[in-house]
C-alpha cells in the first residue's frame, strides 16, 4: 500500500545515536504517544531492556529498510544482546501503524530462548545498536 507507516517514537535518555532521521515526527497531541512517520520503510521497531524485575523501553521508531520480521502484525520481541549481567535486550519489528507501542509478551529472564550468560556482552552505549 502507498500509505506510509506510522510508529511510536521514543528514545530513552542516555541512549547513544538516534533513529529520528528515519522518519518525520508528527504532532499527535497529548492523547497519543509521540509518533514518527517512516521515510525509508514500512516497518516499526522496539527495543526493551529486561532485567530481573521489569522491562524498560529503550527505543521505538522506524527501521531504515524493510526486512524479515517487518511483515509481522504485532511486536513479538526476540532476545538480541546482554548489555550487562542480569539484563537482556529484546527487539521486535512489525508492519502496522503503532505496532511497536508495546510487546505482546516477553519471556521471563533466563527462560529457554533467552541468550545465556555467555551470550554477547555489549559495551556501554553499544548495546542498542547491537540489538538493531
Amino acid at each position: 500500500p502507498p500509505n506510509r507507516r506510522t510508529c511510536v517514537f521514543f528514545e530513552a535518555p542516555g541512549v547513544q545515536g538516534s533513529t529520528k532521521t528515519l522518519g518525520e515526527l508528527l504532532d499527535t497531541g497529548p492523547e497519543l504517544p509521540r509518533a514518527i512517520r517512516c521515510l525509508y520503510s514500512r516497518c516499526c521497531f522496539g527495543i526493551w531492556n529486561l532485567t530481573q524485575d521489569r522491562a524498560q523501553v529503550e527505543m521505538q521508531g522506524c527501521r531504515d529498510s524493510d526486512e524479515p520480521g517487518c511483515e509481522s502484525l504485532h511486536c513479538d520481541p526476540s532476545p538480541r544482546a546482554h548489555p550487562s549481567p542480569g539484563s537482556t535486550l529484546f527487539t521486535c519489528s512489525c508492519g502496522t501503524d503503532f505496532c511497536n507501542a508495546n510487546y505482546s509478551h516477553l519471556p521471563p529472564p533466563g527462560s529457554p530462548g533467552t541468550p545465556g550468560s555467555q551470550g554477547p556482552q555489549a559495551a556501554p552505549g553499544e548495546s542498542i545498536w547491537m540489538a538493531l
Epitope: 502507498p2 506510522t6 518525520e24 499527535t28 525509508y40 529498510s65
Partner: antibody, heavy 117, light 111 residues
C-alpha cells in the same frame, strides 16, 4: 556547502537507456537523507522519479518503476539514474535533489535530456 | 496516485498585490492531523526552490510575505505583497502517499 551537479549525455536515441549521474559535494550521501531524481518535460510540471536513501533502500514512481534503476557510488559520492527503453516522452530536464523528510530542500541545476533519433 | 490540481493555472498581478494560489488534492494528504503539503517557486531556466513545508512552515531564508495554510485536501499559498522577484511559477507537492506528486503549476505574471 551542499551542492548537487547532474551530468550525462544530452541526447539519447529512442529505445536506448538514459544514464545520468549526480555528483554531491559538501555532504556524504551515506550519512543521511534520501537522494532523488525528478524530471520536468519542457513547458510542463514536475514528476518525481524515485530515490535512493542513505542506507541504500530505493523507492520508485510506479509509473516508471519497470524502467528505472537508481544506484549509488559511495567512493565518488555520486548517485545515478538509469531509465531504459526511452521514448520522446522522456525528453525532459532531469534534476537530482536531496530530500530532508519528504520535501526537496536542495536541487541540482538540472540537465536537459532529449530523446531523438 | 494522489492528483494535485492548482488554480489558477496563471494569473496577472501588480507589485504590491496580495496573491493567493490554491492546490486541491484528490484525497486527503493528512496523517494524524499533520499535512504533508509543500510549496516551491521556480523561475525560468532554474531549479525549483522550497518555500513552504508541511503546509505552513516557512523554509529558512524565505521572505515572510510567503505563507501557507490548509489541511486535508485544500491548501493555499499566499504572497502578502507581491515583489518584482516573485514573478515565477509555483508548484505544490504532496508527500502523504507514494508516489510524491506535484501540481501542474501556477504562473504569476506581471500585469
Amino acid at each position: 556547502q551542499l551542492q548537487l551537479q547532474e551530468s550525462g549525455p544530452g541526447l539519447v536515441k529512442p529505445s536506448e537507456t538514459l544514464s545520468l549521474t549526480c555528483t554531491v559535494s559538501g555532504y556524504s550521501i551515506t550519512s543521511d537523507f534520501a537522494w532523488n531524481w525528478i524530471r520536468q518535460p519542457p513547458g510542463k510540471g514536475l514528476e518525481w522519479i524515485g530515490y535512493i536513501s542513505f542506507s541504500g533502500s530505493t523507492s520508485y514512481n510506479p509509473s516508471l518503476k519497470s524502467r528505472v534503476t537508481i544506484s549509488v557510488d559511495t567512493s565518488k559520492n555520486q548517485f545515478s539514474l538509469k531509465l531504459s527503453s526511452v521514448t520522446a516522452a522522456d525528453t525532459a530536464v532531469y534534476y537530482c535533489a536531496r530530500s530532508r523528510y519528504s520535501w526537496f530542500a536542495y536541487w541540482g541545476q538540472g540537465t536537459l535530456v532529449t530523446v531523438s533519433s | 496516485d494522489i492528483q494535485m490540481t492548482q488554480s489558477p493555472s496563471s494569473l496577472s498581478a501588480s507589485v504590491g498585490d496580495r496573491v493567493t494560489i490554491t492546490c486541491r488534492a484528490s484525497e486527503s494528504v493528512d496523517t494524524y492531523g499533520n499535512s504533508f503539503m509543500h510549496w516551491y517557486q521556480q523561475k525560468p531556466g532554474k531549479a525549483p526552490k522550497l518555500l513552504i513545508y508541511r503546509a505552513s512552515n516557512l523554509e529558512s531564508g524565505v521572505p515572510s510575505r510567503f505563507s501557507g495554510s490548509g489541511s486535508g485536501t485544500d491548501f493555499t499559498l499566499t504572497i502578502s505583497s507581491l515583489q518584482p522577484e516573485d514573478f515565477a511559477t509555483y508548484y505544490c507537492q504532496q508527500s502523504n502517499e507514494d508516489p510524491y506528486t506535484f501540481g501542474g503549476g501556477t504562473k504569476v505574471e506581471i500585469k
